[in-house]
Structures are given as C-alpha cells and as structure tokens.
C-alpha cells in the first residue's frame, strides 16, 4: 500500500500505535492535530520504535517529509547531547535512538527549529523551520492495552473492519488499542460488532468471544438475549433492548448505563464503561475523578493568548498590552493601528506565530525594565532575580481601589515552557482517556513544587481570598511554597446563571475588583502599601505538599522565579503601589478588614505545564527546561492579566504599561 495515499494509516503494537497522516501541515498544526486525536507527535526513542515507524512510512519519495515530535527553541543548542538541544513534545530529552541526517555543526542556533523525517531511504531526521508546511506528520498514541486482531472465521464475508479511538479505519491491524471497535460481516448477512474492553480479570480483550458467524435461533433461552431476541431470515439472532436501555458490550444483556453513573454534570450511554461522563462548556473532568468536573484554566495552557490571559469559571479572555491591539483571531496582538485588528470571537483554525527569536527583541523590553505597571485586580510578577525569601500570606483587600505593582523585567521564554499552543476542539467534554492522561502532569518531583488545585466547591465571590506565593529556586525544598493553581468548581456564584453562556460568559462585576489594604487617597492618586504580615493574617506557608486551605478556593498567584535579587527581610516585605482614578464599584459592600474578599479570577501568564511533568518551573538550579511547541512569534513583552480594560496608569519615572484591548473567548481547550 502506498503510504502516500490520501488516507492515513497506522501500525499498532501491544501498547502504542503510530499513525501517518499525509496532510500538509506546519509543525504547530501537526502537533495540534495529534493532540486533538488524543495522541502526540511521534517520539521514536528506541531502535524498536524507529523500526515500527520505518515500516509504517515505507519507501516514499525523497521530496516527502513528515513531522515528528522534536523541537528546539532558539539558542538552545547542546550539540554534545544526542538530541542536540531538541526536546520531545512530551517534554523530555530522553532517547536511546537518533537518526540525524548530518553530524552536528557548531552554529549559533539563532532560531527555533523543528524536526522532520525523510519519507525515503533511511528516514533520516532533518531540522528546519517550524513554519514550513511539510507533507505530513506522524502521531503516536499510547494506551493501557491492546486486543489482538481477530482471527478470520469460515463464515465471514470479509476481513474485520477496525475503527481505532483515533478514528482510523482499516482491516490491516495486528493490534487494536483499547477502545477500538471491530465490525465483522458474516456471509449469512448478519454481522457482529465487538469492542476492545477492559476485562474483569484484568487486561483487555474483545467484548465477546467467537465464533461470531454461527446461527442458533431464538429458542431455547431467548437466544441468550436479556430483552428481545430477533430471529433473522438466515436463522441468526440479534438481541435488542427496550426503550431507554442499551445493548451491553456482550451483545445480549441490556443496561441503563446512566442509572448508576455518578456523573456530576452530564451522562451519556456508551463508552467502555457503558456510560461516559461529560462536562459542560468550560469545565473538564477532575484529574483524580473523571466523574467530577472542574473549571478549565485555559491560561495554564500554553499559547492560549499571545500576551495576556484572564481565566474565570467557564471562560477566558485574551488581552494585549498598551499600544497593541488584539487581532481578529482573539489571540494574537499587533502594534496598535498596524493591522486594524478587532477583538473577535471567531474561533477559526487560527495559526499562532512561529515564536522564532529575533535578535532585536530586547529593545521592546527597555521601556518596561523595572517600571511600574497598573494591574487592577491582579498580583503577578516574574522578576529575573528573586529575593531571598519565601512568603505566602493572605491580606484582606478593600474593594474600592485599583492597585499598581512593580513589574520587573520578566524572563522570557519562561524556564519551563509547556506545549505552546493548544488545539481548538468542537468537543466540549473530555471522554478520551488518552487525552486526559496526556495533558495532566504526573506527581511532582522533589525539586518541582506541586500544583495544588482547589477541588472543594468554590465559595461565593464574597469569600474568595487571594494568596500571594513566592517561589524561589535558591531555597531548600522544604521552604519552597507550592504554587497554588486554582480550579473553580462547577458551582457558579449566586448572581450568575448556572450554565456559563457559550457566548460572552459573564465577566466580573465591578464591585468584585480586589484591592490592596492601607490605601490612602491623595487627589486622584491612590497610594497603596502592602504591609508586613499583620497579626490578623496568619501566614500561609505553602511548602511542598501543602494543601490549599478550604477558605481560599481562588488563590491568586504572585510568582517570582529567578536567582539573585537583594535580600528582603521576610518579616516585613512591603509593596508600594500607585494608581490613578480608581474604579468605583457598582455597589460597595462593607466587610470587616480581616475577612474582606478579593474576588479574583485565576490570573496567570500564558504558559502551561509541560506534559507529564509538574507545571511549575523547576526550582532546582540544575533542572533542565524543556521547550515544547511554541510558534507564537515574538514573545509577549508583558504578562499582565486583567479582568477588564485597564484604566490609564499613572506615569512614573520608570515607564508605564497598560492593556489596550482584550477579547472575550469562551471556547475551551480540552
């Protein structure tokens, strides 16, 4: 079979499949396409895996190239290493196999590069521009187990037709991944459908044993059918179920799959367990329990926004820094007036920027270096050099002032960058087991603080308290706070409708703007001081393994990641901020200072966890930083996330920045 025929093809083993898609795509598009199907770009790490890839690719023409899952950021050459500084899209650099077309050359690696495999000859690895659309791509799908291909039976009308969970249909599989369907047509006219399912005794196997093409009739024993038995003309039987029931995997018994299904939001019959739980738009299955639903924090997903991102229950928005406008794709930012871009909810198959570095990128930073930036309702900064302390505490914030906080020059790209671009999917719930396992981090290592999701029900907005957490590589692991990543539960605030609308989900009412304590008004200027930890605020020490206290479901993260700022005393860190023309709340609520809320969305930079690793930047000084698909053009120059268009920042001696435009987006990356 010509591997370059129009249709994709796959080769499967007992624990994984490789699939060849002869579709012209850029690296980013290919990566996205594999992820949408629950897999990843191929990562042939061993000679055995490479051999399977070779047999799948076959002998194509020399002009054909296929993306595999290797990418390198600019200036990340490590020519002495087997992968030469390239990182697998799964986030690591482990390999027992390479197949470079040329020996490593000692160039400066000025730009981002991706790897394509030659379809001809020895299927060598070539590096090149990630924005080129090569002829196809190789995906890899891992699974819990596989069923062997069915043996042909005498009564079969033709070979079994298999459909894999990643939608490939073929008769030529040796192994079928868990979740595959086999359709067998019998000469007598009747067929059988089998599912590759988990067996009660462990492992996986076909949902029914053969022979599949023998007829017995309905009598005796009702043909083995629990409800109705239908005797076909040829004497074969088929079982049917009464209304509201589904035929079980054995093809004989009937079940109401959703009767006992403990789904938090939506249940649908079907799937390996007989039912599948679905989450509404903007939610995803909880990691520890797929029956429950938690809010999807899109801002944790790489490349969701080019510059700035704000997450909230059931939606998110992209923003651009002052002087930039949001482009029509709702993601990218361009200099104001340059493109005439408009904020848009159009969610076509947009292509993000390539992310290849430019030498003069640093120029754009100069205006912001060490400057003050107005950030209403937000605490976030990432200095290049950290203070030598670790602090996490919860001040109470009056709700009638807008804060400003110093914004040191960030490090970009971040030390640990995750797959840079998620995919668009019209599916609004996750039912693909592989997707869940592929996109959720494993347990953190000793040197990577855990992400501690808030899994308890979200408190009302009036009881959400921000948490400021500092994360420093220099500290012993026992003193490094875990970064608290927030997941809202499905419960909406009382004033919001229970279902987040698919168009324009409600953002934050004006009275929910969180503010800082000790605010003094001087004319139109508001000066805010963050004092040392007052007695009525117990320090929240978020060490490794710390759990988010139930009273703080929405933790706003103030992260610093770097190495050598001057030491600041831990007892009395202070933060002086200034803002002009504070926004008046729609209605003010008097709350005692100690319990005053900060109704904050989860506001995070547009960077995400690396697949199968902890999503926190490595705090160990020698940790390697995997760089995963990133084609998002010149790096965002500011990472400030605002719940509403920013007021004009008060000019200071050190420069200013604000947000010019944002786009409300409610599609969810799954």
């Amino acid at each position: 079979q010509d591997p370059w025929a129009a249709e994709p093809r796959a080769a499967c083993g007992p624990s994984s499949c490789y699939a060849l898609f002869p579709r012209r795509r850029t690296f980013l598009e290919a990566w996205r396409a594999c992820r949408e199907l629950g897999g990843d770009l191929a990562t042939p790490r061993t000679p055995e895996e490479a051999q399977r890839v070779d047999s799948l690719v076959g002998a194509g023409p020399a002009s054909r190239l296929l993306w595999i899952g290797l990418q390198r950021q600019a200036r990340q050459c490590q020519l002495q290493r087997p992968l030469r500084g390239f990182t697998w899209t799964t986030g690591d650099q482990d390999t027992a196999f390479t197949n470079w077309a040329q020996p490593a050359s000692g160039g400066p690696c000025p730009a981002q590069r991706c790897v394509a495999l030659e379809a001809s000859g020895e299927h060598r690895w070539l590096e090149g521009s990630c924005t080129l659309a090569v002829d196809g791509y190789l995906c890899q799908f891992g699974f819990e187990g596989a069923c062997p291909a069915l043996q042909d039976e005498a009564g079969q009308a033709g070979p079994a037709v298999y459909t894999t969970p990643f939608h490939l249909v073929s008769t030529e599989f040796e192994w079928l991944p868990f979740g595959s369907v086999a359709a067998v047509q019998c000469q007598a006219g009747r067929g059988a459908s089998l599912l590759c399912v988990k067996q009660p005794e462990g492992g996986v196997g076909w949902s029914r044993a053969g022979p599949l093409c023998l007829g017995t009739g309905c009598s005796p024993d009702n043909g083995g059918c629990e409800h109705e038995c239908v005797e076909e003309v040829d004497g074969h039987v088929s079982c049917r179920c009464t209304e509201g029931f589904r035929l079980a995997a054995d093809g004989r018994s009937c079940e109401d799959p959703c009767a006992q299904a403990p789904c938090e939001q939506q249940c649908e019959p079907g799937g390996p367990q007989g039912y599948s739980c679905h989450c509404r738009l903007g939610f995803r299955p909880a990691e520890d329990d797929p029956h429950r639903c938690v809010d999807t924090d899109e801002c944790q997903i790489a490349g969701v926004c080019q510059q700035m991102c704000v997450n909230y229950v059931g939606g998110f928005e992209c923003y651009c820094s002052e002087g930039h406008e949001l482009e029509a794709d709702g993601i990218s930012c361009s200099p104001a007036g340059a493109m005439g871009a408009q904020a848009s909810q159009d969610l076509g198959d947009e292509l993000l920027d390539d992310g290849e570095d430019e030498e003069d990128e640093d120029e754009a930073w100069k205006a912001f270096n060490g400057g003050w930036t107005e950030m209403p309702g937000i605490l976030w900064m990432e200095p290049t050099q950290p203070p030598d302390f670790a602090l996490a505490y919860r001040p109470s914030f009056p709700e009638d002032r807008e804060p400003q906080i110093p914004y040191p020059e960030p490090t970009w790209p971040p030390p640990l960058s995750a797959p840079r671009v998620p995919y668009h999917s019209s599916v609004l719930s996750v039912t693909r087991p592989v997707v869940v396992s592929a996109t959720h981090p494993t347990l953190p290592s000793a040197h990577q603080p855990p992400v501690i999701p808030a899994t308890h029900p979200a408190l009302s907005r009036d009881h959400q308290i921000p948490v400021i957490a500092a994360n420093y590589p220099d500290l012993p692991s026992a003193y490094q706070p875990g970064i608290l990543s927030v997941s809202h539960s499905a419960q909406p605030p009382a004033h919001q409708p229970p279902m987040i609308s698919t168009k324009y989900p409600e953002l934050f009412p004006a009275h929910q703007s969180p503010m800082f304590p000790d605010t003094r008004v001087a004319g139109t200027q508001t000066t805010t001081h963050l004092p040392g930890i007052p007695p009525n605020h117990a320090p929240l020490v978020t060490t490794l393994g710390a759990q988010l206290p139930p009273q703080a479901p929405d933790a706003l993260v103030l992260r610093t990641q770097a190495t050598q700022l001057p030491i600041i005393p831990t007892a009395q860190p202070s933060l002086t901020t200034t803002s002009r023309s504070p926004v008046s709340p729609a209605h003010q609520i008097s709350v005692p200072a100690a319990t005053q809320p900060a109704a904050l969305p989860t506001l995070l930079p547009s960077q995400s966890p690396t697949n199968q690793t902890s999503p926190i930047s490595p705090t160990h000084p020698h940790s390697k930083a995997p760089q995963i698909p990133r084609e998002d053009g010149p790096s965002p120059k500011l990472a400030l996330w605002l719940p509403s268009p920013a007021p004009t920042a008060a000019p200071t001696a050190l420069g200013e920045a604000g947000l010019a435009e944002h786009s409300q987006r409610d599609d969810r990356w799954l």
Epitope: S63, L65, A101, Q102, E118, S120, T131, D354
Partner: antibody, heavy 124, light 108 residues
Amino acid sequence: QVQLQESGPGLVRPSQTLSLTCTASGYTFTDYVIHWVKQPPGRGLEWIGYINPYDDDTTYNQKFKGRVTMLVDTSSNTAYLRLSSVTAEDTAVYYCARRGNSYDGYFDYSMDYWGQGSLVTVSS
Amino acid sequence: DIQMTQSPSSLSASVGDRVTITCRASQNVGTAVAWLQQTPGKAPKLLIYSASNRYTGVPSRFSGSGSGTDYTFTISSLQPEDIATYYCQQYTNYPMYTFGQGTKVQIK
C-alpha cells in the same frame, strides 16, 4: 549536474493559450517539486504555482487560478505550463525552478535551481 | 497573502563597501526566507536559504539573518561581480510563495 530548460513559442496572440515546457535533467525528477515563476520585463518575480511530479499535486497562485494548468510527464522528465486567455499583461520571462528538499541536514523549500527563462510576448 | 517589503529599492556603493538590504514580512514566516541574486539577463540564483544558511558554493561575503518578520541580507565587501538585483522570498505560507520587490545594487 542539475539542469532545467524552458522552451516554448516566443509569441502568443491575445486570448490564446500560452504553452511552455520545462525539461529537467541531472536528478530524479519525481523527487522534487517544480515551480513556475513569471517576470514581466523590467519588473520583479511573481510566483505562479507548483506541481509535484510524484503525485501530480498542484498548487496555484490565486491570481492565476482558472487560467493556469500545470502537468508533468515523468517518462520524459518534463513539466508543462499552460496559461489561457492571455493578454499583454502576460508578456514576461517565464522560469521553471526546482524546489529544494534538504541541504546539509536541513530541510528547506527554497528554489535551488532555475531554468534560464523563456520570453513570451503576447501581441496581435 | 504574506507581503514581503524590501528596502531600499536601489543603492549605489563602492567596491569593498558593506551593503545591507532588509526585508520585512507582513506576518511571521519563521526562518523560511531565501535571498536570490539576479544578474541582468540571467535567471535568479539562490544565495541564502532558511534566512541565514549560505547555499552551496556561495562566497562567504554573503550572509543573511533574522527570523519572524525582519530579515537582513549583507554583502560584507562589495565586489564588481555583485552588481545585480537581489530578491528576498518567503516560502512558509503554503501554498503561496512571495517575493520582495527587489533591490538593485550598483557600483559608484
């Protein structure tokens, strides 16, 4: 060595069809995409489209769509360009060029070899 | 379509001078940029591919740099045989290939 040679009538009447031939030698014809590029006198280069001799896959510049047809004959290592309904605006030197695949361990889609060009004048 | 804006459109320099030509893409094209040299009456020749890689047999005085949207082509020491028109070309935005308007280099 790799060579590309364009040939065709130097004069075409308006509204008629321009036909050009590009003969390739010195490499495996089906391994490389062939591009066609137009250059009006004293002006810059304009990409018309390409054809992949391996599978006859073609991609055309929107500007020429509907008027352009590209074909190959792999037995004679020849690519063909046909441009219908020509006007004086189509007076130009037409080049065929080979798209590269890889150099020194890099893959790349720049045009590494060009024919010498064929001048076509559209005039009645 | 991606536009490639090349500047200057023409320049005069003395033998031995350093000559720089710039090209700006209307959107990010990564490093999928080539520089071509066309001497009068001849076909274009590939000098630089992938923004910064010198093609086989091209003298070392020719170099290229850039990625994303801004690209630079440099002749470090202009020679008489370098009199030609130079074009930048992007080839990332499949299926469209586009060229810059060209820069005519002359000797003073």
